[in-house]
């Protein structure tokens, strides 16, 4: 029996080279959010602590921006960014809630058309 609910942006797609906002929202609980961790599969991307603020993992500093809110913005997307992302909410007194987002990074439409159509 869980009290809260995590709402996420679900399955999303974005173009290579572009940006995307990963967003989760915890609802249906009065629990206090003490920290939110963002992970990409098995890597920690960022932490937002209620007292200490944001910390971005050094290996992602150039391409990850905090916010908006408790969300995360990924920039300069590559096809290697395709995969699962998790928002992990640590709350008191409820415990931990986890949301999942699947991101697919597509080749840009310009690149696709360039590959498909050749000018004679």
């Amino acid at each position: 029996m869980m009290t809260g609910t995590i709402e996420t942006t679900g399955n999303i797609s974005a173009e290579k080279g572009g940006s995307i906002i990963l967003q989760c929202h915890l609802s249906s609980t009065t629990a206090q959010v003490t920290q939110v961790n963002w992970e990409q599969q098995d890597q920690l991307l960022a932490i937002c602590n209620a007292d200490l603020g944001w910390h971005i993992s050094p290996s992602f500093k150039d391409r990850v921006a905090p916010g908006p809110g408790l969300g995360l913005t990924l920039q300069s997307l590559t096809v290697n960014d395709t995969g699962e992302y998790f928002c992990i909410y640590h709350t008191y007194p409820d415990g931990t809630y986890t949301g999942r987002i699947f991101l697919e990074v597509l080749e840009s439409s310009v690149a696709e058309h360039g590959a498909r159509f050749q000018i004679p």
Partner: nanobody, 127 residues
Framework: EVQLVESGGGLVQPGGSLRLSCAAS????????RGWFRQAPGKGLEWVST???????????TYADSVRGRFTISRDNSKNTLYLQMNSLRAEDTAVYYC?????????????????WGQGTLVTVSS
């Protein structure tokens, strides 16, 4: 099939310490929700602590008010073992302690439904 086996219980004097262990087999997920519960003689099951861990490095522990500051939940990934370090033990901590694991990690806390349980280990605090 997931199997959980607790150990480390015993008789200890008030103010003493014990460390409980819970060895898991078949529980090899990248995200884990595990916890400790206890049942005192003649009483219902009581949540003690939960631990959410992920291979990405997230480590979130939560405690019941009655044990916060005295008990610490931890884990050893290499041994796939969960621990409960119990310090400053009191007579009211006397109970059978159970380790539990949850398959889904969408929620990990005192109100979560746990899928797998160990057989329990008895902790008696008495002088």
């Amino acid at each position: 099939e997931v199997q959980l086996v607790e150990s480390g219980g015993g008789l200890v004097q008030p103010g003493g310490s014990l460390r409980l262990s819970c060895a898991a087999s078949g529980y090899t997920y990248s995200r884990k929700c595990r916890g400790w519960f206890r049942q005192a003689p003649g009483k219902g099951l009581e949540w003690v602590s939960t631990l959410y861990t992920s291979s990405g490095g997230t480590y979130f522990d939560t405690y019941a008010d009655s044990v916060r500051g005295r008990f610490t939940i931890s884990r050893d990934n290499s041994k796939n073992t969960l621990y409960l370090q119990m310090n400053s033990l009191r007579a009211e901590d006397t109970a059978v302690y159970y380790c539990a694991a949850r398959l889904s990690t969408d929620f990990c806390g005192p109100r979560a439904d746990f899928d797998y349980w160990g057989q329990g280990t008895l902790v008696t605090v008495s002088s």
